[in-house]
Interface confidence: low
């Protein structure tokens, strides 16, 4: 199916930028892995590079504004032609859910006292309003609550006294049109406007003042322009060369508004001075190699020794990584393919242990399934032997750091009937539903 092709993918927002055009295939658009595409306007933007997880979204607002609730965040597998870690297809959402509490208590409404006395009328003649008030203290609201309804109410009042009305001008009417719209006619153009003493008219009993000034105004029409000339387009210029050496690019044609040039305020040419076309080099763009994550460390061994486990004997171990994705003469991966370090092996060594403090509460699991819970743990942590932290392997080559490696067998006193891990679980409260944010916008 044809897609909309863009020249940039903005990692921070996940939006496509720099529309190149539509009606091209995903495969053609993604000849350049820096490009991105949308299946429809306003739809999900997918970059052409290898799939990887987006940044986590910000945490959604707490599901309740008071007491303990829950909040969600998500990330999305974005990219083309492959899978994200965990063998996940592009477009897939992954969720996290955590407990939250915006405000410990919930508001409680208050009730009104009785109404107070009426205040005096707001005017000394004609009709006005008077007001009375009541207090929100019966009972008083708690935790940011309020009382239902209004704290004051008003009603009309009549002083039984007539007010005098002074005259005031209504707004000026419009200027009458000039007799000509361009200069150079037979008569000198004039314009006139008038106003009425009706906003309001002065009263007779009691007598009001008349409007000051004149009811009419006249002036000469000045600065009339010469009659305008509308602009017209010249012919399209030559098509510019394709500006890229691989993938898709954009060529341009230009024209000038000079056939004729607009004069005396005449309108500029309607339409665009440039038009663009997609050009296809049909050449794939180079793709640089990227290191995979490091592999596991190999077992800690020493040449010519069967085992160095549980002994103060330093050994060596290595780990490797693979350069992936290099295509079409892209750059090779920079840096080393192998990493070597010195180590002490504590694999399967019985070690004295001690119980850790409680860990922080974990995320709510499952984030989108029924009855999510969160957990925290205390672990039986091994006390590492006090072996020297650095060794000199070869005379004159200086000291090298030595790392403990392997899974020891820590021994702690039993805690709550457990020898290695004590776990505490709690349900997550007020859990919101997981919804695709792209679908929610539609």
């Amino acid at each position: 199916d044809p897609v909309l092709c863009f020249t940039q993918y903005e990692e921070s927002s996940g939006k496509c930028k720099g529309l190149l055009g539509g009606g091209v295939s995903v495969e053609d658009c993604c000849l350049n892995t820096a490009f991105a595409y949308q299946k429809r306007s306003g739809g999900l933007c997918q970059p052409c590079r290898s799939p990887r997880w987006s940044l986590w979204s910000t945490w959604a607002p707490c599901s309740v504004t008071c007491s303990e609730g829950s909040q969600l965040r998500y990330r999305r597998c974005v990219g083309w032609n492959g899978q994200c870690s965990g063998k996940v297809a592009p477009g897939t959402l992954e969720w996290q859910l955590q407990a939250c509490e915006d405000q410990q208590c919930c508001p409680e409404m208050g009730g009104w006292s009785g109404w107070g006395p009426w205040e005096p009328c707001s005017v000394t003649c004609s009709k006005g309003t008077r007001t009375r008030r009541r207090a929100c203290n019966h009972p008083a609201p708690k935790c940011g609550g309020h009382c239902p309804g209004q704290a004051q109410e008003s009603e009309a009042c009549d002083t039984q006294q007539v007010c005098p009305t002074h005259g005031a001008w209504a707004t000026w009417g419009p200027w009458t049109p000039c007799s000509a719209s361009c200069h150079g006619g037979p008569h000198e153009p004039k314009e006139t406007r008038s106003r009425k003493c009706s906003a309001p008219e002065p009263s007779q009993k009691p007598p009001g003042k008349p409007c000051p000034g004149l009811a009419y105004e006249q002036r000469r029409c000045t600065g009339l322009p010469p009659c305008p000339v509308a602009g017209g387009w010249g012919p399209w210029g030559p098509v510019s060369p394709c500006p890229v050496t691989c993938g898709l690019g954009q060529t341009m044609e230009q024209r000038t508004c000079n056939h004729p040039v607009p004069q005396h305020g005449g309108p500029f040419c309607a339409g665009d001075a440039t038009r663009t076309h997609i050009c296809n080099t049909a050449v794939p763009c180079p793709v640089d190699g990227e290191w995979d994550s490091w592999g596991e460390w190999s077992p800690c061994i020493r040449r010519n020794m069967k085992s160095i486990s549980c002994q103060e004997i330093p050994g060596q171990q290595s780990r490797g990584r693979t350069c992936r994705g290099r295509k079409f003469d892209g750059h090779r991966c920079a840096g080393q393919q192998q990493d070597i370090r010195h180590c002490y092996s504590i694999q399967h060594c019985p070690l004295k242990g001690s119980w850790s403090e409680w860990s922080t509460w974990g995320l709510c699991m499952p984030p989108c399934g029924p009855n999510p819970t969160r957990a925290r743990q205390r672990l039986c942590t091994p006390l590492l032997p006090k072996y020297p932290p650095t060794v000199s392997m070869v005379e004159g080559q200086g000291e090298k750091n030595v790392t403990f490696w392997g899974r020891p067998l820590p021994r702690c006193e039993e805690l709550q009937g457990q020898k290695l891990v004590v776990e505490e679980k709690r349900p997550c409260l007020h859990v919101p539903a997981c919804k695709d944010p792209e679908e929610e916008e539609l």
Partner: nanobody
């Protein structure tokens, strides 16, 4: 604006039962908490019971606990107060009232007459042998 009309009052013997109903007009009925008050001759108005907008929470005064039952049907815009094991001291005019609801709850809130925006005209209950 909500109009409230009580019905179901009358004369009953001690130990007998009555069912009072309060019919509300207006489409916003389901957004209000509903309460019942009573006023005996020569005495102050006394709170009896209240039910939140959804019916999830119901609160009763200590004097009637276990004898009176409050319920509502938002589809029918009606609240019922079932009076059982009636005593002569239950004789009073019974009033239905509507209060703004929301996050607000608790006996202290719903027992205060000042939080109720709309009141009915009342229905008389007489318990006499």
């Amino acid at each position: 604006q909500v109009q409230l009309v009580e019905s179901g009052g009358g004369l009953v013997q001690p130990g007998g039962s009555l069912s009072l109903s309060c019919a509300a007009s207006g489409r916003t009925f389901s957004s209000y908490a509903m309460g019942w008050f009573r006023q005996a001759p020569g005495k102050e108005r006394e709170w009896v019971a209240a039910i939140t907008w959804s019916g999830a929470n119901i609160y009763y005064a200590d004097s009637i606990k276990g004898r009176f039952t409050l319920s509502r049907d938002n589809a029918e815009n009606t609240v019922w107060l079932q009076l059982n094991s009636l005593k002569p001291e239950d004789t009073a005019v019974y009033y239905c009232a509507a209060a703004e609801s929301g996050r607000y709850s608790g006996r202290a809130y719903y027992s205060a007459p000042g939080v109720y925006l709309y009141w009915g005209q009342g229905t008389l209950v007489t318990v006499s042998g």
